[in-house]
């Protein structure tokens, strides 16, 4: 077990190991072009991410694989994501022609935790917004962030209501990150 | 070099110095009335900030000067900002009379990094939203926050699409901050 | 006073105690159904919260009581909240029948600090948005988060412009948290 310098704060009996901050698991992932995938009717598709080019990085055993951030050690993490959505209401738009209405009723982002030992994913954070834009081109971000107690082996992903509406053009518009506190 | 207590975590060969949390660079800046400044056509103007009155502070060598937060040491920082925009569509409004339409097509906030050795700024975070308000008075916030690896000497600023639409009336509505993790 | 291992970084004369991260005050609170309460005309009502079931927790002397998070030790805290609002414009809606218009002009969230020794609460963060939805059902989140220097004994609460519009249906939609940095 990691020893470090140990001390017993007066308000707590157990010894807590000290920890170098630069050694903590951290990740900031940025948007990439999404490849349309099959997903079940009532299940929001997961985004995949850039994890090492530009502003994106993973460090200290926090790994990204197959749409998931893998939690390498138990603890309290701050988790955040922004997804920028955009659409066009022009009749001739490519998306409209493909039979998908691109002025949706709503847009939703969910940060989800998956634990191998438990079959059902846990929704940690949800940002959901009705869409009533009247212009022909609309765009807007949904931002989420909060602290959660995670276990080693947990996996995190970001799900959205409609992948075709996600703005993947710039790494600063759509992103996903987590760091051990 | 800062020594502190050192230990070698099992998953990493190098020694990482321990660090007192109260000693880390931190800042929370709050809005002030903006003085209109010249800016190039395709370049968003930077906001300037209150750094020591009310809720605002800088500490541990994190300094604010001339619209910039100066990063005093390399590391991973959490950076955040909220900008509240507002406008009026009344014909008689002061801003409309000045010849600037104050029902814009969109509102945008960008948190930007500037490195002295390189003239071109790097956009770290962007929140951008189309505006389709139908009432005469409209207002809304854009919030941004994420973690980035910064280098000593980097400078951070907040740029907006239109300074005249920024709500500078209250320190809790429009703000900008960063802290070393 | 908590001793720990002490060291004097070169840029500061005072000794700063090292601190185990797992020992820091932290809380993440989640929404519950609100019981309508009397509140003064110009004062926004405070939300109450779940503090121990599901994703909610308090730890390391950070306690929740009677709508307030109690700050157990002085320091810099990151504080955040998201409130999801929703309403219906249908004439037959329950809320409309009760005589309260549920298409409000605006929606507002405020994170407020109360200090026993000071009579007036301090507004730390405000997210406020005009509402111009045109559909019959509307919903949207307001997210806030920033860092503040708090004192032992300070109390934090979340106030909203209209409790009846808060979406209390899911713990991932409306939440409130704080952690010592």
């Amino acid at each position: 077990a990691l020893k470090g310098q140990e001390f017993a704060p007066s308000h707590q009996q157990v010894y807590a190991p000290l920890r170098a901050d630069g050694d903590k698991p951290r990740a900031h992932l940025t948007v990439v072009r999404q490849t349309p995938t099959q997903h079940f009717k009532n299940q929001f598709p997961a985004l995949h991410w850039e994890h090492e080019l530009g502003l994106a990085f993973t460090k200290n055993r926090m790994n990204y694989t197959n749409k998931f951030l893998l939690i390498p050690e138990s603890g309290d993490y701050f988790i955040y994501s922004q997804v920028t959505f955009r659409g066009m209401t022009s009749e001739s738009s490519e998306i409209r022609q493909a039979g998908r209405p691109n002025k949706p009723d709503s847009i939703t982002v969910v940060i989800t935790k998956v634990t191998d030992s438990y079959p059902e994913p846990t929704q940690l954070l949800m940002g959901t917004k009705s869409v009533s834009e009247v212009g022909s081109n609309w765009f807007q971000p949904i931002y989420l962030g909060a602290m959660f107690s995670l276990q080693e082996g947990d996996k995190l992903m970001v799900n959205v209501s409609d992948i075709s509406l996600v703005d993947y053009t710039k790494e600063d518009k759509t992103f996903f990150g987590a760091f051990l506190l | 070099a800062l020594k502190g207590q050192e230990f070698a975590p099992s998953h990493q060969q190098v020694y990482a110095p321990l660090r007192a949390d109260g000693d880390k660079p931190r800042a929370h800046l709050t809005v002030v009335r903006q003085t209109p400044t010249q800016h190039f056509k395709n370049q968003f103007p930077a906001l300037h900030w209150e750094h020591e009155l009310g809720l605002a502070f800088t500490k541990n060598r994190m300094n604010y000067t001339n619209k910039f937060l100066l990063i005093p040491e390399s590391g991973d920082y959490f950076i955040y900002s909220q900008v509240t925009f507002r406008g009026m569509t009344s014909e008689s409004s002061e801003i409309r009379q000045a010849g600037r339409p104050n029902k814009p097509d969109s509102i945008t906030v960008v948190i930007t990094k500037v490195t002295d050795s390189y003239p071109e700024p790097t956009q770290l975070l962007m929140g951008t939203k189309s505006v389709s308000e139908v009432g005469s008075n409209w207002f809304q916030p854009i919030y941004l926050g994420a973690m980035f690896s910064l280098q000593e000497g980097d400078k951070l600023m907040v740029n907006v699409s239109d300074i005249s639409l920024v709500d500078y009336t209250k320190e809790d509505k429009t703000f900008f901050g960063a802290f070393l993790l | 006073a908590l001793k720990g291992q002490e060291f004097a970084p070169s840029h500061q004369q005072v000794y700063a105690p090292l601190r185990a991260d797992g020992d820091k005050p932290r809380a993440h609170l989640t929404v519950v159904r609100q019981t309508p309460t009397q509140h003064f005309k110009n004062q926004f009502p405070a939300l109450h919260w779940e503090h121990e079931l599901g994703l909610a927790f308090t730890k390391n002397r950070m306690n929740y009581t009677n709508k307030f998070l109690l700050i157990p030790e002085s320091g810099d805290y990151f504080i955040y909240s998201q409130v999801t609002f929703r309403g219906m414009t249908s004439e037959s809606s329950e809320i409309r029948q009760a005589g309260r218009p549920n298409k409000p002009d605006s929606i507002t969230v405020v994170i407020t600090k109360v200090t026993d020794s000071y009579p007036e609460p301090t507004q730390l963060l405000m997210g406020t948005k005009s509402v111009s939805e045109v559909g019959s059902n509307w919903f949207q989140p307001i997210y806030l988060g920033a860092m503040f220097s708090l004192q032992e004994g300070d109390k934090l609460m979340v106030n909203v412009s209209d409790i009846s519009l808060v979406d209390y249906t899911k713990e991932d939609k409306t939440f409130f948290g704080a952690f010592l940095l």
Partner: antibody, heavy 124, light 107 residues
Amino acid sequence: QVQLVQSGAEVKKPGASVKVSCKASGYDFTYYGISWVRQAPGQGLEWMGWISTYNGNTHYARMLQGRVTMTTDTSTRTAYMELRSLRSDDTAVYYCARESYYGSGEYRGGMDVWGQGTTVTVSS
Amino acid sequence: EIVLTQSPATLSLSPGERATLSCRASQSVSSYLAWYQQKPGQAPRLLIYDASNRATGIPARFSGSGSGTDFTLTISSLEPEDFAVYYCQQRSNWPWTFGQGTKVEIK
């Protein structure tokens, strides 16, 4: 202007190590990764590996794994490539190259700025 | 690792002619393919990134196309300075890999 300047030619004996430096100027060093590419006399280009100047993550060609180490010093805006246990077939011109990235999920870019090359000769 | 096969190995053409160079990947690389030009004694130069995007300062006579496994670099009308070796490189999966090169020589 944007440029990468490499260290000078080296002559090494088999079994020795060589460390080539690559100093960047004119751009935000930590934003763009650095790849190292070598070219043996009369041969094609061989990608050796990549390092993130942002946080030091690396990827190496399988053939060189265990013999090559790439590092960066952000304070001097310099990337380094060390190759150990040199053999005669390591004789080549070694290039560093900036990995362009356009900050967009649409594009992966390419190696848009190259150093002038460093000739490493391995001979007994 | 992904293997890139370029063809032909050598292309003999006259100035003004059209050059068509091929690069085939052993598995899909989406559109993450770059083309480089190298002249004797010089460092390579980026021509095309992401299969079809011209790099800064590259003349319009150079164009790229393709996605998945089959890619083409076209030089619409060869200029004297275009006679060189051309390499494709995949940037889809680590390790990055280069093709073996196509030499475009004067006929």
